[in-house]
């Protein structure tokens, strides 16, 4: 059959913000298949960071970064 | 517990070489970006150089670029700084540390002295 | 890159006192300012995080506030293991990290 595409899940989240220069990007974590709906912060120091996308310094990063590069995330 | 163990310091002459290393251990060390930190005699902490968990990213103090070369092990859970070209205003307490992720430093090995005489 | 100006550079004080340090950024870092405690011959110890968070295992006499450039650290009641020397960080920018000059807290 097809190979599988592995699915990236989000098992604990930052309970810290992350300051907006350190970040690099982000990604939408909505499989079905994850126990939770996340965010994943890709610093600039190339670490993925889990958090919470209701949180408002979540939303708030994800603005920044989108007034930063203008491409659609997935 | 959380260690950073720190060895290589030394007396050296300007111009030559000397290696710093910083053996980590009680936490998951191949995580983790690190910090070179340094500090003068009598003066305050500079920033000296950062290096990404898994080593693709280094960034340099302005004052060390081209000179100083950060880099890790993570089989060996160890830190190194290579110092080339060293300069009498290079003489410090050399610290590891890490990077919390949001900025802040901890944990901090205990110092290695550095000094560059002739 | 953003400068850190500490104050006063020195003080001296008594077991019991409170007393108060401030850090004045170059420019607005909101509140990614952390603390740190020396003491002489030892590695600085992280004591608070985003201005205000306390890290785990530092007393609670310790405390830090302000955002934006002005920031405080408060001890509430001097101990005689808290004279050191203390320095602010500002945490906002990548990746140069900068520091205060220090302030050298002595026994009166």
């Known amino acids: 059959g097809p190979a599988s595409v592995p699915t990236t899940c989000c098992f604990n989240l930052a309970n810290r913000k992350i300051p907006l220069q350190r970040l690099e990007s982000y990604r939408r974590i909505t499989s079905g298949k994850c126990p939770q709906k996340a965010v994943i912060f890709k610093t600039k120091l190339a670490k993925d960071i889990c958090a919470d996308p209701k949180k408002k310094w979540v939303q708030d990063s994800m603005k920044y970064l989108d007034q930063k590069s203008p491409t659609p995330k997935p | 517990q959380v260690q950073l163990v720190q060895s290589g310091g030394g007396v050296v002459q300007p111009g030559r070489s000397l290696r710093l290393s910083c053996a980590a251990s009680g936490f998951t060390f191949s995580s983790y970006g690190m910090h070179w930190v340094r500090q003068a005699p009598g003066k305050g902490l500079e920033w000296v150089a950062v290096i990404s968990y898994d080593g693709s990213i280094k960034h340099y103090a302005d004052s060390v670029k081209g000179r100083f070369t950060i880099s890790r092990d993570n089989s060996k859970n160890t830190l190194y700084l290579q110092m080339n070209s060293l300069r009498t205003d290079d003489t410090a307490v050399y610290y590891c540390?890490?990077?919390?992720?949001?900025?802040?430093?901890?944990?901090w090995g205990q110092g290695t002295m550095v000094t560059v005489s002739s | 890159d953003i400068q850190m100006t500490q104050s006063p550079s020195s003080v001296s004080a008594s077991v019991g006192d409170r007393v108060t340090i401030t850090c004045r950024a170059s420019?607005?870092?909101?509140?990614?300012l952390a603390w740190y405690q020396q003491k002489p011959g030892k590695a600085p110890k992280l004591l608070i995080y985003?201005?205000?968070s306390l890290q785990s295992g530092v007393p609670s006499r310790f405390s830090g506030s302000g955002s934006g450039t002005d920031f405080t650290l408060t001890i509430s009641s001097l101990q005689p293991e808290d004279f050191a020397t203390y320095y602010c960080q500002q945490a906002s920018s990548f990746p140069s990290i900068t520091f205060g000059q220090g302030t050298r807290l002595e026994i009166k």
């Open positions: 985003a201005a205000s």
């Open positions: 420019q607005d870092i909101s509140s990614w």
């Open positions: 540390a890490g990077d919390t992720d949001y900025g802040d430093i901890d944990p």
